[in-house]
């Protein structure tokens, strides 16, 4: 996920809409002026925001990489939400990339867990149950299997 | 406790500039997220500028975009806000002020109007 024009955009154009700030705060989909004195609208499909604020400027909107599909897209209130592509995830150690889920468990363990957008299929132990630690077995050690279907969008 | 310290300001002509500095004590100066407001008489206090604890992010008013510039100085625990080309309508107290609870997205530092500890003000007058 990448952030779009990192560099600060003018806001307050003559047709955003405007209001009062209640309370000091703009509520979500809008930011406050450089004065306080008024709530602007943010931009649909560039930037937004999700709570009541004091912001001098709505968050940006952020793009889907290569890799990743998007699920919604950006509106004032809501960032996009981008999911990994069917056979790929994303850790949670690791969430600016999203990578490969593994084939096949390692001799000796069985799949207990497909894989999905933010997990690795998960291989167990036969005997012991316990989890294995998973880096990529070399191919003669792999017993295959085919990626599982992204389930539901992970937020 | 953050404190500010300013400098800097006076009196100075049209078409002039001035550089304001704002010095921090009390915290470590690289965690801080900064912003210089001002305020007119009888006017409400208006954002300037701000800048990210590691100056990648900065953001500026409409109005003072390409005449103003904000900067940092990590090691010297000080901002600074240059001004050039100085109009009668920039004449108002100056504020530093800090986040004690920034917000961040996707890395990138938002500021916001309601920033938290203030230093004591400046005043800038510009002559026609």
């Known amino acids: 996920i990448t952030q779009q024009d990192l560099a600060p955009q003018q806001r307050a154009a003559p047709q955003q809409k405007r209001s009062s700030p209640s309370e000091g705060l703009c509520p979500p989909g809008h930011h406050i002026s450089e004065d306080g004195r008024d709530c602007i609208s943010c931009k649909y499909g560039q930037d937004y925001s999700t709570h009541w604020n004091d912001l001098l400027f709505c968050l940006r909107c952020t793009r889907c990489d290569s890799g990743e599909v998007e699920l919604s897209p950006c509106t004032t209130t809501r960032n996009t939400v981008c999911q990994c592509e069917e056979g790929t995830f994303r850790e949670e150690d690791s969430p600016e990339m999203c990578r490969k889920c593994r084939t096949g468990c390692p001799r000796g363990m069985v799949k207990v867990g497909d894989c999905t957008p933010w997990s690795d299929i998960e291989c167990v132990h036969k005997e012991s149950g316990t989890k294995h630690s998973g880096e990529v077995p070399a191919v003669e050690e792999t017993v295959t299997s085919s990626p599982g279907t992204p389930a539901s969008p992970c937020s | 406790e953050v404190q500010l310290v300013q400098s800097g300001g006076g009196l100075v002509q049209a078409g002039g500039s001035l550089r304001l500095s704002c010095a921090a004590s009390?915290?470590?100066?690289?965690?801080?997220?900064m912003g210089w407001f001002r305020q007119a008489p009888g006017k409400e206090r208006a954002f300037v500028a701000a800048?990210?604890?590691?100056?990648?992010?900065?953001y500026y008013a409409e109005s003072v975009k390409g005449r103003f510039t904000i900067s940092r100085d990590n090691a010297e625990n000080t901002m600074y806000l240059q001004m050039n080309s100085l109009k009668p309508e920039d004449s108002a107290v100056y504020y530093c002020?800090?986040?004690?609870?920034?917000?961040?997205?996707?890395?990138?530092?938002?500021?916001?109007?309601?920033?938290?500890?203030w230093g004591q003000g400046t005043q800038v007058t510009v002559s026609s």
């Open positions: 002020a800090v986040e004690s609870q920034p917000t961040y997205s996707g890395g990138v530092y938002y500021p916001r109007y309601g920033m938290d500890v």
């Open positions: 009390g915290s470590t100066f690289s965690s801080l997220d």
């Open positions: 800048i990210s604890r590691s100056g990648d992010n900065i």
